[in-house]
């Protein structure tokens, strides 16, 4: 499946769409980013490309999302990693591919682990490999909550815009 | 896990239930397709059927999803992939498994890649086997925008009600 | 990624946080619950620790969660697997895990899966292995209906609050 | 440019302790088995075992089992080694590598004696 | 475990002569399922690390010159040094991964004739 994007020119039309109202009018806090990428070793965050928004009072401030009012809200994330043959050198050990969804607030001073997923790929065994990791649930924040996520594995990250993605939704 | 499902006769009548209301009333636009367990070598969405449903004007045309009202959408979708050795060579080529969900939008010819999984199996080399994929974000929509699928591994995909889905709702 | 939660008290201080109000104020039923822990061998839920919760009429019984009124829900589930090497053969049988979310309804007198997912894992041929199952949906519930999980695998369950969790909340 | 750097080593009395320190830099350390491998003077290779810095997964040889520890900080990019009970044949320059690029550390030499 | 052996132990040679080392397994290294060999050669100097030549049997690493290359399948391996230079005197060993514990042959010592 070509990783096919609309032009951030396209997309930007299509977010100002004259007169696109919401569904059932009342504007909620959402958000959806996409992995930047231009950035092959890390994973950066953008809301200003694609089909990437932030809606309502979220903001995106050093790759965290923050949080705009208190509330329930739903948070997901997804990421795909990929490996070509013959990679791994002198080694038959597996890589170990994670994803996690962390919280920061003002509450407890450390990142909290709201969402984790996590793989062990065999890459002498099995090239090319391709692996696809998503999670998401309901969560209780906080106004001023901040958002982020922290990957293992980020130089084999399938990075376009609807294989790596970070969102959020008050309910 | 048996993949055991209601007859559509009693998931219609649970849909019909009478004075079935929505919790806190106002209705929005919601859908929650199947795939169609009776058609093996291709994925065909259904509504009529199980827990599926279309509401508040959604449709379901030409197996893609029509966006009733703009505004931004919860998008889903899941299958399930499996298999039993098809060749008795434990050197065989991987498999390619991919689902993607995509738009197809009046503002630009083309379908875009919303949400991407892929995976690569090595049916030589671990069989039976099963692998199941899951995605869903927001996105914005306008009204008239068509939601479908493309699925890479159709043969291999297990159909029911549970297994296989597509859907979406506004917020 | 370590498995760090909230003590069940921060997490308590969070979620009675004073004037901690709704973003756009209309209570919605919600819940969010965790696999217990403390339990190896079962998958027991919690809403009364770390992020959990239930708010809005959900309640739990008899480790299901009950429907408080006829509506939309989302509906979603996580588990993650893991195992260490307990045989060194290539040749070890795999390993069946499954993860499955199930409607119990006054409607019809057996559970009906409304998501499942399915894996093979092959010990003997990787290992250590991790596996992380995702899934979720919107389906059409009536007050009182109960929602419940059904694991195969339930030794291998890497339980921390932000691995294996279970939730649904109103649309 | 990737790194590995040990170090840690040094004279240990018989039955002591020592903890070594492996640095890694210049590539994402905690997807990467970080193994430990030691050479006795003028003898060949002998692997220690490894450790998943990410996962905390770890895999020992058996003769080293019960003795040795592994442990990382993915914060810190570093992995460890904690070994118990010295005796005079573990006398070694003990080295960390990293399998899947072909890195290797310089070494850093443990001397066991009293 | 699977027990490596290298053969010669040690041997002596000119610059510019063919060079080759064995290594022997117990046990087949090679995997079934996708043809390759779970086997890797290093080079040491005195008082230095071990540098990756080989893997997977007959992989060079990057930045090795093209006189050395890796051959053999199952358990039996070479190592060739097509045209010895100076800086090749060294120890040489081959290892493992197919299974735990790794392990390494004794060391093929190349000397100066």
């Known amino acids: 499946l070509p990783g096919v994007g609309l032009t951030p020119s396209a997309a930007q039309t299509a977010r100002q769409h004259p007169k696109m109202h919401l569904a059932h009018s009342t504007l909620k806090p959402a958000a959806h980013l996409i992995g930047d990428p231009s950035k092959q070793n890390s994973l950066l965050w953008r809301a200003n490309t694609d089909r990437a928004f932030l809606q309502d009072g979220f903001s995106l401030s050093n790759n965290s999302l923050l949080v705009p009012t208190s509330g329930i809200y739903f948070v997901y994330s997804q990421v795909v990693f990929s490996g070509k043959a013959y990679s791994p050198k002198a080694t038959s050990s597996p890589l170990y591919l994670a994803h996690e969804v962390q919280l920061f607030s003002s509450q407890y001073p450390f990142h909290v682990p709201l969402l984790s997923s996590q793989k062990m790929v065999y890459p002498g065994l099995q090239e090319p490999w391709l692996h696809s990791m998503y999670h998401g649930a309901a969560f209780q924040l906080t106004q001023g909550d901040q958002l982020s996520t922290h990957t293992d594995g980020i130089p084999h990250l399938v990075l376009s815009p609807s294989t790596v993605f970070f969102g959020a939704f008050a309910l | 896990l048996p993949g055991v499902g209601l007859t559509p006769s009693a998931a219609q009548t649970a849909r019909q239930h009478p004075k079935m209301h929505l919790a806190h009333s106002t209705l929005k636009p919601a859908a929650h397709l199947i795939g169609d367990p009776s058609k093996q070598n291709s994925l065909l969405w259904r509504a009529n059927t199980d827990r599926a449903f279309l509401q508040d004007g959604f449709s379901l045309s030409n197996n893609s999803l029509l966006v009733p009202t703009s505004g931004i959408y919860f998008v889903y979708s899941q299958v399930v992939f499996s298999g039993k050795a098809y060749s008795p060579k434990a050197t065989s080529s991987p498999l390619y498994l991919a689902h993607e969900v995509q738009l197809f939008s009046s503002q630009y010819p083309f379908h875009v890649p919303l949400l991407s999984s892929q995976k690569m199996v090595y049916p030589g080399l671990q069989e039976p086997w099963l692998h199941s994929m899951y995605h869903g974000a927001a996105f914005q929509l306008t009204q008239g925008d068509q939601l479908s699928t493309h699925t890479d591994g159709i043969p291999h995909l297990v159909l029911s009600p549970s297994t296989v889905f597509f859907g979406a709702f506004a917020l | 990624l370590p498995g760090v939660g909230l003590t069940p008290s921060a997490a308590q201080t969070a979620r009675q946080h004073p004037k901690m109000h709704l973003a756009h104020s209309t209570l919605k039923p919600a819940a969010h619950l965790i696999g217990d822990p403390s339990k190896q061998n079962s998958l027991l839920w919690r809403a009364n620790t770390d992020r959990a919760f239930l708010q809005d009429g959900f309640s739990l019984s008899n480790n299901s969660l009950l429907v408080p009124t006829s509506g939309i829900y989302f509906v979603y589930s996580q588990v993650v697997f893991s195992g260490k090497a307990y045989s060194p053969k290539a040749t070890s049988s795999p390993l069946y895990l499954a993860h499955e979310v199930q409607l119990f309804s006054s409607q019809y007198p057996f559970h009906v899966p409304l998501l499942s997912s399915q894996k093979m894992v092959y010990p003997g041929l990787q290992e250590p292995w991790l596996h992380s199952m995702y899934h979720g949906a919107a389906f059409q519930l009536t007050q009182g209906d109960q929602l419940s999980t059904h694991t195969d695998g339930i030794p291998h369950l890497v339980l921390s609050p932000s691995t294996v969790f279970f939730g649904a909340f109103a649309l | 440019e990737v790194q590995l750097v040990e170090s840690g080593g040094g004279l240990v009395q018989p039955g002591g302790s020592l903890r070594l320190s492996c640095a890694a830099s210049?590539?994402?350390?905690?997807?990467?088995?970080i193994e430990w491998v030691r050479q006795a003077p003028g003898k060949g290779l002998e692997w220690v075992g490894e450790?998943?810095?990410?996962?905390?997964?770890?895999n020992y040889n058996e003769e080293f089992k019960g003795r040795a520890t592994f442990s990382a900080d993915n914060s810190k990019n570093t992995a460890y080694l904690q070994m118990n009970s010295l005796r005079a044949e573990d006398t070694a320059v003990y080295y960390c590598?990293?399998?899947?690029?072909?890195?290797w550390g310089q070494g850093t030499l443990v001397t066991v004696s009293s | 475990d699977i027990q490596m052996t290298q053969s010669p132990s040690s041997l002596s040679a000119s610059v510019g002569d063919r060079v080759t080392i064995t290594c022997k397994s117990s046990?087949?290294?090679?995997?079934?399922?996708?043809?390759?060999?779970?086997l890797a050669w290093y080079q040491q100097k005195p008082g230095k690390a071990p540098k990756l030549l080989i893997y997977?049997?007959?992989t060079r690493d990057s930045g090795v010159p093209s006189r050395f290359s890796g051959s053999g399948s199952g358990t039996d391996f070479t190592l060739t040094i097509s045209s010895l230079q100076p800086e090749d005197f060294a120890t040489y060993y081959c290892?493992?991964?197919?299974?735990?514990?790794?392990?390494f042959g004794q060391g093929t010592k190349v000397e100066i004739k």
């Open positions: 590598a990293d399998g899947y690029h072909g890195y």
């Open positions: 210049g590539y994402t350390f905690s997807s990467y088995w």
């Open positions: 450790i998943s810095p990410g996962s905390g997964s770890t």
């Open positions: 046990q087949s290294l090679l995997y079934s399922a996708n043809q390759k060999n779970f």
């Open positions: 997977w049997a007959s």
């Open positions: 290892q493992q991964y197919y299974s735990y514990p790794r392990t």
